[in-house]
């Protein structure tokens, strides 16, 4: 048979951050190539990454069309140089991926503190609105554009001179916190989607501290 040296893909895994979405699988091919297909539950199959020797396929362009849909992918294995060959049942070997719903499952990318400004005993901390790969009307939408009120941020802040952390939450991209006069503070933020059951939190942003370039200090 044409498939004697062909093995089915396995360990199909979705890797997705801010909707940049790649399907990965094993094994590294030996005398075989792969083609990937993707579909929504109710839709037709669309082929991607034709006859590739890679073990990953970027499916971002397909899933960003409707991030709230649930997707299924499958990876077909073909003998190298003989891609018309089929298995004993008359079709090439393939393996299905787990289902994937981008809106519920894409990882939240590491956020960035855009700026902070102190006015007296208050500090305003602003979180950068990360760009996603979801595109509408030739414009890339931001994380807030996609998730709206589902997205909140948690701020961790502490005096530079101590290790005791305080937290604040916002469902916008800004925090206004009270600080002690004359003290320098450090800040880190985390994106959170509380309604999720998986991948609820991003990694923490890089730490930014007062007295460094990014912030602005105004004594009033």
């Amino acid at each position: 048979s044409g498939t004697t040296n062909t093995v089915a893909a396995y360990n199909l895994t979705w890797k997705s951050t801010n909707f940049k979405t790649i399907l990965e699988w094993e094994p590294k091919p030996v005398n075989q190539v792969y083609t990937v297909q993707i579909s929504t539950k109710s839709g037709d199959w669309k082929s991607k990454c034709f006859y590739t020797t890679d073990t990953e396929c970027d499916l971002t362009d397909e899933i960003v069309k409707d991030v709230k849909q649930t997707y299924l992918a499958r990876v077909f294995s073909y003998p190298a140089g003989n891609v018309e060959s089929t298995g004993s049942a008359g079709e090439p070997l393939y393996e299905n991926s787990p289902e994937f719903t981008p809106y519920l499952e894409t990882n939240l990318g590491q956020p960035t503190i855009q700026s902070f400004e102190q006015v007296g005993t208050k500090v305003n901390v602003t979180v950068e609105d990360e760009r996603t790969l979801v595109r509408r009307n030739n414009t890339f939408l931001s994380l807030r554009d996609v998730f709206g009120k589902d997205l909140i941020y948690t701020l961790y802040y502490w005096k530079s001179s101590s290790s005791g952390k305080k937290t604040a939450k916002t469902n916008t991209n800004e925090f206004l916190i009270d600080v002690d006069k004359g003290e320098n503070y450090c800040f880190s933020v985390q994106a959170v989607i509380p309604s999720r059951t998986v991948n609820r939190k991003s990694t923490d942003s890089p730490v930014e501290c007062m007295g460094q370039e990014k912030g602005e200090f105004r004594e009033i």
Epitope: V67, V134, N137, D145, V146
Partner: nanobody
Framework: EVQLVESGGGLVQAGGSLRLSCAAS????????MGWFRQAPGKEREFVAA????????YYADSVRGRFTISRDNTKNTVYLQMNSLKPEDTAVYYC??????????????????????WGQGTQVTVSS
């Protein structure tokens, strides 16, 4: 959820102008994108315009682009629709909606995390010829 109240509708002659307002009460107005939709008698509700949470991005239906302008004032929790060069076919009840920008642009496709957002009660715009 935010509560929305539209105002500014009325009767105007073709070629005239109106400015609609949508005042929001409730928490975190600036977490929401805002959209204007309209529904003419016997027709389905249709998208008119949307603005992102920060006001940095605006989107328009082809039928109103160049004539209507959407804007927002996050300090006043209000979104506006400036309507110029009005036509009889602009006659409809105009509604504002608070949701994610994605949901406003895509409409109600359903699926996880989707709801209909927050809607106001609407304001009537009538354009006479």
């Amino acid at each position: 959820e935010v509560q929305l109240v539209e105002s500014g509708g009325g009767l105007v002659q073709a070629g005239g102008s109106l400015r609609l307002s949508c005042a929001a009460s409730g928490r975190a107005f600036s977490a929401y994108a805002m959209g204007w939709f309209r529904q003419a008698p016997g027709k389905e509700r249709e998208f008119v315009a949307a603005i992102s949470w920060s006001g940095g991005s605006t989107y328009y239906a082809d039928s109103v682009r160049g004539r209507f302008t959407i804007s927002r004032d996050n300090t006043k929790n209000t979104v506006y629709l400036q309507m110029n060069s009005l036509k009889p076919e602009d006659t409809a009840v105009y509604y504002c909606n608070a949701d994610s920008l994605l949901s406003l642009l895509d409409g109600s496709r359903g699926g996880p995390g989707t709801d209909s957002g927050s809607w106001g009660q609407g304001t009537q715009v009538t354009v006479s010829s």
